[in-house]
Each structure stands twice: as C-alpha cells, then as structure tokens.
Interface confidence: medium
C-alpha cells in the first residue's frame, strides 16, 4: 500500500544495500497492513533533502548541520524522530558544545580576543562551526577567508585539518595541524589536552569531553565553562552554560503531509525487532558494509520528536545563530553591545493594536510580533522572532522550562517611588461564586466552571492542582459538568460554556470573550457557577468600574469567595479566604536579551507607566479598560528581580512543585517539546 510505505533515502551503494536489507527484514516481522520500507538512492544528503521536499522520498537521517539545510526554504523539512545514545533510562539526544577554560584564568566569553584557542578540527560542530559562528561578528574584518579572520582574532591556535601553509597561526599550538590522532591535539580529547597542557587558554569541545578525560572530580574542579552571558560555571553545569545544544542525528520529513506517525511506527517497530542486541540477522545500528549507514552505529534507539517541536526549536537559537552567521556572513551594523529595538510579542488582534501604539510612542524602540497563543509567543521568543512578553506565572514556568528567564515583575500593590525596587509577595488565587448560590469548595462536582485559561496560575494551575490532589486523576472535564477553560480541546466539555465568537471559540486569547480574568468573571456572571480568578477581579469589574454593558450594573456584594475549609467569605477578605498565593506576572526574555529588555522597559515605564494620569490623551502602558492587554491593567510598575532571576527562584519552590505535579495532566505541547 503506497500510503503505508516509507521511502527511505540512501546516499551511497552501501547505504542502499543496508536499506534493502532493512526493507526485507521489516517485511518479515510486520503485518501486511503495517508500514513498509521502500528505498530511494540519491547522490548526497542534500539531494535526499530535495527529494523529500519534492515528495520523491519520505525520510532520511541527518547530522545537525544538514537538519539546518533541511529546515531552510524551500525545503521546509522538520525533525520527526531522534536517535538516542546512552541508556534507555537516561537517553541522550543532544550534546552541548562548550568552551572550557582553566579555573585560575580570569577572562570571559567577550574577552577571547588575543587568547590561545584549542579546536577539535576545522569545520567540526563543537570545535569550529559553533564557537566561530557565535564569535563571527567579533572577528576582525574582512571576515573572509574565515581562517584568516580567526587567525587574527586569537593569538595562536590549534585547528586540526586547517591549512598550515596559508594560516600558520592556526597551527601554532600543533605544528602542521595534523588531521588524525597522530596529532596529539586532534579531536575532542586532543583539544582538551591542548588546554590541559597549557598550550591553549580555551578549548572548544563537547560537554562530555571533560568527564571522559578526567575521571576524578577534584581534577575536573580545576576547570570551568565560559557562558554566553559572560559568566562562568562549573563543568557539570553545562545545561545552563553552553555555546549551543546540538542534536546528534535526526530523521527528517516534510512539514506538511510528512507521514511522521507512519515513520515513527516503522522505526519503533524496527528498534523492537532489530535494535541493540535484538537480532543476529539484521542490526539497525551496525552494518558489515561500513560505518554509520542510515543510522549512527553508536545509537541505542529512537525517540519520537514532540509534534510542537519544529526545526528552529529543535536546533535552538544559539545553534541557528552560529550556523547562519557562518553561512550568510552578515553582521548587524550596530556594535553588538548596543541594544537593538525590543520585539514585543502580542497575542492576537487587540494586543497587537496596543503594541503598535506603544511602538509609535516609543519612537521605534519597541517593535511588535504577533502570535495567536501564549505558547506560540514563547516559541517565537525562544527562536529569536520576538524578544519579550509579560506572562502569568503558569507560563513563566513553561517559558523557564524552555530556557527563557524572568526579567521584571509586574507589581500591583506598591506605590511609587519604591515600586521599582520592591519584591511583592504575589496575589491571591481565588474561587468566586454568586452570593445567591449554595456552593462551597466541597460541592463543586458537576458544577459549571470558568477559568482564565489552561496553564495559567489563578485560573488553572492552582485550582486544578488542588483538585488533582483530591480526585487523583486528570479528567477535570468530567469533574465539572461544563465550563470555559480557553486552550482546552475544542470538543471538551470545558469549551462548552465559552462564548467565542466562532472560530475563536475557546482560543486562549482575547478573541475569546471569556478569556483571562475579566473573561472568566464574565463567564460566571452570564453562565457559570464558579470562576477561578485573582482576588482583584471582582472589585475591578463591579461598582461601575468596568463600563462594558455586561458589567456596568454589577455589585461587589453579589459575589463571594470559596475558602478551602468549606466556608465562604466576602470578596473583601481574600487574605483569609484564598486557594493559594500566586506569583505576580513577569516579563520574560531570552538570556542574551534580558539586560536590554530590562533597561528599555524601565525607561519606557518612566514615560508611559502609572505616573501618566490622563490615559484618554496619552499612551498608557498599563491601561486597556479591563482587558489586560500586554500587561495586567492593575500594574503599578515593573520591578527589578534582584536575585530572583531564574524561573525557579521567581516562582518559588512551592509553586514550582505544584505545577510540576500538575504536569501529569499537562496538555502543553510546548512544555512537552521543551522537556524532550
């Protein structure tokens, strides 16, 4: 059956032979209606990429550099399955390219000019492409030929396989630049030895190199890693201090109509039958015909790449930056230490309007990028299409798991002028009901619920976390009879109460009328039994404070809070009747952009923050008539975080634990991708 056939692309006679053997052996173990293998032979990996894009083949396994080529237009391929190394219990699908230095040296990443460098080899990922790609814009001009620019940047190097005649400085630390193990400074161990011997000041290797060469922790402690933010970390902190995370070997397919489920079904069956130590007749991860045919010999198995993970996310911002710099050879005209405009990520139409207005008022210091969901915005910040946005704590957690950092906190209670330097404790997550109802925390089953959005703190993580510990399952849509929790599956009962309009029904953005704090409260007013919101929501939308038709006649005393002990209290008493304390919303950014974002926002709030009294005639950053566009409307200021500059420190241990527990119930495709 052609639609059940996976056309594998082979790039040599030996690969084609192994592919045919793969095809025949899979035929013998799979049912006739299962997936099958067909083999397509091409002259090179690039030809395979083009063939897949043109629907003449379906899959090929590629190294990271080629995954980048495959992702570029017009190919538009995406990673679908990753080879893993190490054990099944602790599978490694990536390695980290790092810059290792001796602890007793005193320079940072931005002070490498004039140092001596040790590389694994010319054109190799961790040893050349990544470090030189990331340093590219700091190299002296002209930057072509690249080897000459690198030779003029460092005071001496060992770059195995470089041309020692044309570029003698690149071979200064290893005469002749030998391209094999005859050169004592060749490859990973060699580059590390070059540092260890004191020939070089920095070695560009992979994270495991130091562990493979120094079994003793005391010896490893004599070395540190250089981080991109110009700090240093210990060698075992490579996940937080690396030049780039590099995928090892990856199966790619078309982004649209790519048969990714079929490819996974095929490879999953293949690893069951012909994986490591499974079969004598045919081995997926070795071959009598040659090394690394179709798959790496060192692979131990396959893992399915999460569907939300596109090539940009898979390769990572640092890796793409490095490769793009090397390939395109373009650098910004502005010096790299100057802050470029900050691209704010706006959710859907109304936020985009406010962002455009901010952009004009900021004289172009703010630019705007749009996405339809918060997770799409986070992904855009990760891959460099956007730089920053302000997020509810639940999304600060997801952003943190995806490598972003909190930059500034929204403060709601601290009056100026101390606001900017005050760390607030957070706000209360509350459950609101109508005073006329007989509901308590203990009899919510079967009732109609209203949530700000799935994954948000007050509207979801806190109430559903508490509920989970009571009911011990994730079927919240069965617990409530119906509800509106924007971001739920469209056919779920938790989309039933949402107002839309269609096609935006239940979408987690302002196009859904019941989205966010005000939306969830409106849902309670018009349809629901309970709303999970922040403690300020009722006062902010009653007593004529919200002029919209649905809210203008509402009275605060018609609503009450549910307390966890089964009692109820007035909305004026959140301190004594709340579900939990929630961390304030916070601005997040990539690490490399955090300082610029902070500086610019502090400057912007001085001009457009809460000191502006007349928002009818001036642009106000924290005002949007109860719609919480870009920031919460009750924000007094954006405050510095001081030492709370990681998502764990910012959110606090208790909240992180609660959200981590709820991950069993996670419906976040982005979180799944970021924890892959």
């Amino acid at each position: 059956v052609p639609e059940k056939s996976v056309r594998w692309c082979a790039v040599s006679e030996h690969e084609a032979t192994k592919c045919q053997s793969f095809r025949d052996h899979m035929k013998s173990v799979l049912p006739s209606n299962g997936p099958s293998v067909a083999c397509v032979k091409k002259a090179s990996h690039l030809d395979c990429i083009r063939a897949i894009a043109a629907n003449e083949a379906d899959a090929v396994t590629l190294d990271a550099g080629l995954v980048y080529d495959a992702y570029l237009a017009p190919n538009n391929l995406k990673p679908v399955v990753a080879e893993f190394y190490g054990s099944k219990e602790d599978p490694q699908t990536f390695y980290y390219a790092v810059a290792v230095v001796k602890k007793d040296s005193d320079f940072q990443m931005n002070q490498l000019r004039g140092r001596k460098s040790c590389h694994t080899g010319l054109g190799r990922s961790a040893g050349w492409n990544i470090p030189i790609g990331l340093l590219y814009c700091d190299l002296p001009e002209p930057r072509k030929p690249l080897e000459k620019a690198v030779a003029n940047f460092f005071s001496g190097s060992c770059v195995p396989c470089a041309d020692g005649t044309d570029f003698p400085q690149l071979c200064q630390l290893c005469p002749g630049c030998g391209c094999s193990t005859l050169n004592q400074y060749f490859s990973y161990s060699g580059a590390f030895k070059c540092l260890k011997d004191g020939a070089g000041d920095v070695a560009f290797v992979k994270h495991s190199t130091i562990f493979e060469n120094l079994a003793n922790k005391a010896d490893r402690d004599q070395y540190e890693l250089l981080c991109l933010d110009n700090t240093r970390k210990s060698v075992d902190e490579y996940k937080d201090c690396h030049l780039a995370r590099v995928p090892s070997h990856t199966v790619v397919a078309r982004s649209v109509g790519g048969k990714e489920d079929l490819i996974w079904e095929l490879l999953n069956q293949a690893q069951e039958h012909f994986g490591k130590d499974k079969s004598k007749e045919f081995q997926l991860f070795s071959s009598p015909h040659g090394k690394d045919l179709l798959f790496k010999d060192s692979a131990h198995g396959f893992l399915k790449v999460p569907p939300r993970m596109d090539a940009k996310m898979y390769l990572g911002y640092e890796y793409i930056t490095a490769i793009r710099n090397l390939r395109e050879g373009t650098c910004p005209e502005a010096p790299t230490d100057e802050c470029k405009p900050v691209k704010w990520c706006a959710l859907s139409h109304h936020e985009r309007l406010k962002c455009d207005e901010w952009s004009v008022n900021s004289a172009g210091k703010i630019e705007c990028e749009s996405a339809e969901t918060t997770e799409d915005c986070i992904a855009k910040i990760m891959n460099g299409e956007a730089d920053a946005m302000s997020l509810d704590g639940g999304f600060v957690y997801i952003a943190g798991m995806c490598g972003l950092v909190p930059v500034l906190a929204e403060n709601y209670n601290t009056p100026n002028p101390n606001c900017e330097n005050t760390a607030e404790e957070g706000y209360f997550a509350v459950a609101v009901v109508k005073s006329s109802s007989d509901l308590t925390w203990d009899n919510l089953k079967g009732k109609k619920s209203c949530h700000t959005a799935v994954g948000r703190t007050a509207g979801w993580n806190i109430p559903m976390g508490l509920l989970y510990s009571k009911i011990n399952h994730c079927r919240f849509d069965e617990f409530f009879s119906e509800g509106c929790a924007p971001g739920s599956e469209k056919n779920s009962s938790l989309c039933k109460l949402c107002m839309g309009p269609s096609p935006n029904l239940c979408e987690p953005n302002n196009k859904e009328g019941y989205y966010g704090y005000t939306g969830a409260f409106r849902c309670l007013v018009e349809k629901g039994d309970v709303a999970f919101v922040k403690h300020q929501t009722v006062p902010q939308n009653t007593g004529g404070k919200n002029p919209d038709a649905w809210a203008k006649n509402l009275k605060e005393e018609d609503y009450e809070l549910l307390c966890l002990d089964g009692s109820r209290k007035s909305v004026q008493e959140p301190a004594n009747c709340h579900l939990a304390r929630a961390p304030n919303h916070a601005v997040v950014a990539r690490k490399d952009k955090a300082d610029c974002v902070q500086t610019l926002l502090l400057d912007q709030q001085r001009m457009f923050g809460s000191s502006v009294t007349d928002c009818s005639s001036n642009f106000c950053l924290f005002e949007s008539k109860t719609k919480d566009l870009l920031f919460r409307d009750d924000t007094v200021c954006l405050a510095k975080l001081h030492d709370r500059n990681t998502y764990e420190k910012y959110l606090g241990e208790e909240y992180v634990k609660a959200v981590t527990n709820l991950r069993k119930c996670s419906t976040s495709p982005l979180l799944e991708a970021c924890t892959f």
Partner: nanobody, 117 residues
Framework: EVQLVESGGGLVQPGGSLRLSCAAS????????MAWYRQAPGKGLEWVSG???????NYRDSVKGRFTISRDNSKNTLYLQMNSLRAEDTAVYYC???????????WGQGTLVTVSS
Amino acid sequence: EVQLVESGGGLVQPGGSLRLSCAASGSIFSIATMAWYRQAPGKGLEWVSGITRSGSTNYRDSVKGRFTISRDNSKNTLYLQMNSLRAEDTAVYYCTDYSSRYYHDYWGQGTLVTVSS
C-alpha cells in the same frame, strides 16, 4: 461613535506617488495616536506607520524613506504621502485611531491603492 473615512487611493505606475487622507469624526482625534494599516489581497492586516499626538512618527522598515505620515489636528485629518511606489505596496489602506481608550474595531472602509504598469 467614531467614524473614519479614507480617500486618495487609485491606480498608479511603479515609482509614482499618491497622497491618502483620513477624515475622523466623533473621535478624540487631536489627542489620539493615529496609524495607517494595509491589507494586501489574500494577506493579513499589517501596520504601515503611526504618529503620536505630538507628531512623532514611526514606519515599517519596507516603507521608510518612501512614505510620510502627517496630521492636521485642526481638520481632524490624517495623511499618508506615498512616493516611489512599488507593486508590493498594492493593498487596501485603512486608518485607525487607537487612543488607549479604544481597543475596539474602529476601521473605515479603506481606500484601494493599486501599483501596476
């Protein structure tokens, strides 16, 4: 009720010029930030240029140096002078008043600009 009426569009050859106008009534024009947006056939709405009440301006990169936004507060009118027009400028052009009081959809009917030889 805010009313915005755009005019001045038409057919023009590549390299030619047009001046668009937008008359506003019922709005707080003189104290609002104003902007031009455009929508090319089959594409989404994109921001072109904006001007604050004090007259500071901002443009999308692709029109910088070719388009000039201005306003006449006494006439409640917004302008967009478009020079060196290109085929990719073909679109329906809309003006909007987005004072921070309004995040509602106040859009006029737009004016069509076609750049073609």
